[in-house]
């Protein structure tokens, strides 16, 4: 390990997973590093091996239990350390006292489906995955629709400022192929960030009826 610019970022999925990314400029790709989790009020300690995801970054998941089990609460503190092997010893490269509910990133929404489609409209629903019951309704969503000839980055963002697991897309073009994605974010947590985007849902609007103004 070298003293290049380094960054250690972890997020809690609100149930039983802490995902961490460690990046360090100039570090050797075969450097052996791990994340160690030491909670303040739990009997378990957890370790995961950091595996390369790019030239200078590594990632791992601390799996704390069954996917839908509530393993941490708002009062928990988990001390997270990055340990890298230097010869015969382990060196602490980064350390933080991690407050799970200040550092949330939920799983991407799942089970996207077209509820109803017309010539100019489409109603789509989805579900959230592995989200804590603590949030009750304190979630928000962002959605985007990919139109022909455009990129995802160009797609305008639609914001849903409440826990609403459906959307009615309007002013669509008849007989046109679209794709749709959605992501979710809890309102809680200073360092909380958006979930990954869902898998895209492809759909096609109905053709306009011949001889009719639709």
């Amino acid at each position: 390990a070298v003293n290049g610019t380094s960054q250690f970022t972890c997020f809690y999925n609100s149930r039983a997973n802490i995902s961490c990314v460690w990046s360090q400029d100039g570090a050797l790709q075969d450097t052996s590093c791990q994340v160690h989790a030491w909670p303040d009020r739990r009997r378990w300690n957890q370790t995961c091996e950091l595996l390369p995801v790019s030239q200078a970054s590594w990632a791992c998941n601390l799996i704390l239990g069954a996917p839908d089990s509530q393993k941490l609460t708002t009062v928990d503190i988990v001390t997270l350390r990055v340990l890298c092997r230097e010869g015969v010893r382990w060196r602490v490269m980064a350390i933080q006292d991690f407050k799970p509910f200040e550092n949330l990133r939920l799983m991407a929404p799942i089970s996207l489906q077209v509820v109803h489609v017309e010539t100019h409209r489409c109603n789509i629903s989805w579900e959230i995955s592995q989200a804590s019951h603590y949030f009750e309704r304190h979630l928000e969503f962002e959605a985007r629709t990919l139109s022909p000839g455009h990129t995802w980055e160009e797609a305008p963002l639609l914001t849903l400022k409440q826990k609403q697991e459906w959307i009615c897309l309007e002013t669509l073009t008849p007989d046109t192929q679209y794709e749709f994605q959605v992501r979710v974010k809890p309102l809680q947590g200073e360092f909380t960030t958006w979930s990954p985007w869902s898998q895209p849902l492809a759909f096609r609007t109905k053709p306009a009826a011949l001889g009719k103004d639709t």
Epitope: N3, S6, R91, A94, I95, Q96, D97, K99, E102, F191
Partner: nanobody, 126 residues
Framework: QVQLVESGGGLVQPGGSLELSCAAS????????MSWVRQAPGKGLEWVSS????????DYADSVKGRFTISRDNDKNTLYLQMNSLKPEDTAVYYC???????????????????RGQGTQVTVSS
Amino acid sequence: QVQLVESGGGLVQPGGSLELSCAASGFTFSNYAMSWVRQAPGKGLEWVSSITGFGRGTDYADSVKGRFTISRDNDKNTLYLQMNSLKPEDTAVYYCARYSSSTYYPPTPARGRDYRGQGTQVTVSS
């Protein structure tokens, strides 16, 4: 806005003790790692000690290890530095500093600080 105000400095004889305090405001104190740094006359900034957001991890420069103790009281939004067995070479302006996140990096402890206070003068002399 973020404010860090140090106090507790003064003149002390070699071998004596002082406790520095740093009152923090304008941010959620427990969400951030903190540190003490110092600047001796005519010298650059020197890292002294760091502490994680809830005090479960602490780190010290070799020059102060065993003599200084960093701690924090998150209920009072206050960072402390207990300095014992003071030496003339500890004479400096002491600053409390916030890291930009809950993480600090022991191999490069000067990295990632985003706010610093105005400092408090510590003079060790007989």
